[in-house]
Interface confidence: low
């Protein structure tokens, strides 16, 4: 079987203040188990903004329903945008381990830019 | 003018505690982090720490874990670090560096450094 | 944790001659967006540190070009291409990859 791949379509996204961004996120197969998380920034101080498995992210919502049966889409919608949170955001893999998950493969990212809110 | 200014130097007894703060100007402060970094005399660098000033997430040296505690007041683009149960080893200078964007996350502004001396 | 090594630990240099300066990690510092998590910073006697270059081989806004940084994977250069008697201090790499994130032990560059 073909090794999962984690395709983000868009390599950038332009939004006005204010307004939502949707971030695209597919995964290619279900194998290796394990959740999805989205990050803005790529190394070590890249930030959580997502999490499927745990947490409470009260501007983020989801595109489809991730846990429904062979759901293949990750993508996610982050409303009132800023300035700040302009950056390249990267959509994850995890394969699950124990004690804790093991990061398996990213996306190449999408770089958000925030356009001034139109007066 | 962007810059970063810290607090003085501070004299502590071992046990005691000590607040530095890094008030940042010039830029906005919610579109980056602050790192904390310390450099004992005549040694090299340390990183202790940092904070994103965007969602206030901190990410702390394992070594430092349960002492150290990084915070920030956007209303004043302030960033504190609080060291406690202060030992003679932590006499260091102690510096805040901006992270220059957090897909990046090379330290490109430093303030000036606070010493703080540890002494009984 | 990763181990960043630098060398030389101390670097004689007559100004106006080339100079070079190594910096190996124990882990690959490639991340898959393509970019080095590998920054170089220059502390000059009495000063904080300044950011030199970002991401292996990025020279940081008002860096002069005779700094350069290049190197992949586990393997870094910093060189100067003609030292001036203002370059000297200690030249430290540090890598951002993985947290923590960790700093080379210096390389003291002096005028001879």
């Known amino acids: 079987e073909d090794e999962l791949q984690v395709i983000q379509p868009e390599k950038s996204v332009s939004v006005a203040a204010g307004e939502s961004a949707t971030l695209r996120c597919a995964m290619t197969s279900l194998i290796p188990v394990g959740p999805i998380m989205w990050f803005r920034g790529a190394g070590a101080g890249r930030e959580l903004i997502y999490n499927q498995k745990e947490g409470h992210f009260p501007r983020v919502t989801t595109v489809s329903e991730l846990t429904k049966r062979n759901n293949l889409d990750f993508s996610i919608s982050i409303s009132n945008i800023t300035p700040a949170d302009a950056g390249t955001y990267y959509c994850v893999k995890f394969r699950k381990g124990s004690p804790d998950d093991v990061e398996f493969k990213s996306g190449a990212g999408t770089e958000l830019s925030v356009r001034a809110k139109p007066s | 003018q962007v810059q970063l200014v810290q607090s003085g130097a501070e004299v502590k007894k071992p046990g005691a505690s000590v607040k530095v703060s890094c008030k940042a100007s010039g830029y906005t402060f919610t579109s980056n982090g602050i790192s904390w970094v310390r450099q004992a005399p005549g040694q090299g660098l340390e990183w202790m720490g940092w904070?994103?000033?965007?969602?206030?997430?901190?990410n702390y040296a394992q070594k430092l874990q349960g002492r150290v505690t990084m915070t920030t007041d956007t209303s004043t683009s302030t960033a504190y670090m609080e060291l406690r149960s202060l030992r003679s080893d932590d006499t260091a200078v102690y510096y805040c560096a901006r992270v220059g964007n957090m897909d990046q996350e090379y330290f490109d502004l430093w303030g000036r450094g606070t010493l703080v001396t540890v002494s009984s | 944790d990763i181990v960043m090594t630098q060398s030389p630990l101390s670097l004689p240099v007559t100004p106006g001659e080339p100079a070079s300066i190594s910096c190996r990690s124990s882990?690959?510092?490639?991340?898959?967006?393509?970019?080095?998590?590998l920054d170089w910073y220059l502390q000059k006697p009495g000063q904080s540190p300044q950011l030199l270059i970002y991401l292996g081989s990025n020279r940081a806004s008002g860096v002069p070009d005779r700094f350069s940084g290049s190197g992949s994977g586990t393997d870094f250069t910093l060189k100067i291409s003609r030292v001036e008697a203002e370059d000297v201090g200690v030249y430290y790499c540090?890598?951002?990859?993985?947290?923590?994130?960790?700093f080379g032990g210096g390389t003291k560059v002096e005028i001879k």
């Open positions: 540090m890598q951002t990859l993985r947290i923590p994130p960790t």
């Open positions: 904070i994103s000033a965007y969602n206030g997430n901190t």
């Open positions: 882990q690959s510092l490639l991340h898959s967006n393509g970019y080095n998590y």
